[in-house]
């Protein structure tokens, strides 16, 4: 599974019975696709409505989905109504559901006198239209999928640095006498629904996932 969970809102694994509205829609679509395999499912790409064939079977292989990717008819749920990003058994796509589960702490809680070395900001990104895939190729991200007249949006939970230098010398709390430092956004790859001209497919795309401190030792002078 090629993703880190730095800063990811966590959720408890829940029984298969807790299927989402999307899963039901997909099951219905899948049954229809079996009887009429050529019927395309309309998908809207970057706001333009086009007929793109989305095989509902794409949603059946749920092994590789990250809790950082969400398909939902509404904006991402909040923790009070499931921003635990609850994912189903085997860590499937965290679709919107009515199931509620405990939410664990999503990023370090700093106590008095404790500081973060680098400062990050996290948001649900719903305006992703292009991305870089795992092969370094620019791909089009399927922003919305229309299934059985329900429009599902693809959201990504992304974390990036707020500043490359939280303090003048670089990262916070680093001995600047001996070390050069700066904060940088690191990435991971998550499975996302993407499209080329005709076909929708799952691809690993790169998203921002953490803000880390990069250190390099300062050259020491020899007298």
């Amino acid at each position: 599974e090629p993703y880190t969970d730095s800063n990811v809102p966590e959720g408890d694994s829940v029984p298969e019975a807790h299927w989402t509205k999307l899963q039901h829609s997909l099951d219905t679509a899948l049954r229809r696709a079996r009887s009429a395999p050529t019927a395309p499912i309309a998908a809207r790409v970057t706001g333009q409505t086009r007929n793109i064939t989305v095989d509902p079977r794409l949603f059946k292989k749920r092994r590789l989905h990250s809790p950082r990717v969400l398909f939902s008819t509404q904006p991402p749920p909040t923790s009070s109504d499931t921003l635990d990003l609850d994912f189903q058994a085997h860590g499937t796509i965290p679709f919107n559901r009515t199931h509620r589960s405990k939410r664990s702490s999503t990023h370090p809680v700093f106590h008095m006198g404790e500081f973060s070395v680098c400062d990050s900001v996290s948001v649900w990104v719903g305006d992703k239209t292009t991305a870089t895939d795992i092969k370094g190729k620019e791909v089009t991200v399927l922003a919305e999928v229309n299934i059985n007249n329900s429009v599902f949006r693809q959201y990504f939970f992304e974390t990036k640095c707020r500043a490359s230098n939280p303090v003048e010398s670089g990262c916070r709390g680093i001995d600047s006498k001996h070390w050069n430092s700066y904060c940088t956004t690191t990435h991971t790859f998550v499975k996302a629904l993407t499209t080329d001209e005709k076909q929708a497919a799952w691809r690993f795309i790169r998203i921002d996932t953490a803000c880390v401190c990069v250190l390099s030792r300062k050259a020491t002078r020899r007298g």
Epitope: N7, R44, T46, G47, Q48, P75, P76, T78, S79, S80, L83, T106, H107, D119, S120, V121, S122, V123, W124, V125, G126, D127, K128, T129, A143, E144, R153, Y155, E158, T159, R162
Partner: antibody
Framework: QVQLKESGPGLVQPSQTLSLTCTVS????????VNWVRQATGRGLEWMGG???????DYNSALKSRLTITRDTSKSQVFLKMHSLQSEDTATYYC????????????????WGQGTTVTVSA | DIQMTQSPASLSASLGETVTIECRAS??????LAWYQQKPGKSPQLLIY???TLHTGVPSRFSGSGSGTQYSLKINSLQSEDVASYFC?????????FGGGTKLELK
Amino acid sequence: QVQLKESGPGLVQPSQTLSLTCTVSGFSLTNNNVNWVRQATGRGLEWMGGVWAGGATDYNSALKSRLTITRDTSKSQVFLKMHSLQSEDTATYYCARDGGYSSSTLYAMDAWGQGTTVTVSA
Amino acid sequence: DIQMTQSPASLSASLGETVTIECRASEDIYNALAWYQQKPGKSPQLLIYNTDTLHTGVPSRFSGSGSGTQYSLKINSLQSEDVASYFCQHYFHYPRTFGGGTKLELK
């Protein structure tokens, strides 16, 4: 430079439909998100909805049933339509830009129009 | 929806004083918070984004801080031109919501 300008009728009859236009310059609608925010006299700011750079829309759930936001990228215009207006919809209506995830300011609204005042009254 | 609770609703301060305005989110917003200043009869203007980053042209007497659900805006050495209403707003996800605002006046 970046500019947004709201236009529309100053007076709307109760139960009628409000149509506002936000004309933008200095940036592209296909690279930025545009939001509508309103403010009743002496009150706070209320986010109404917005259109993403990609063309998708999101709405304030309390207004969703009466609100439609569209755009015409070739004219650099964003439109707000709200039906069944009542006196409590009397407010100054602003359009505001946010640069989206790829901008340094993320989704903070970094440029605002001057606002247009709408009165709902018979 | 995430609720943003701002306090105080109004405050009076003297020139040169330090003023702090608080904003509490109903849940974690991961530092996706902005502060706006609105002078009487004018449009709101972005002051601070990403919790603590000053927008272009904003004087350094303004600063933002916080994390999780608790955020604050601090104005050091209050100037007469700082008389305005201040609003916090989250952009963690849609729908965006604003705090109720704080009206800052001079004593």
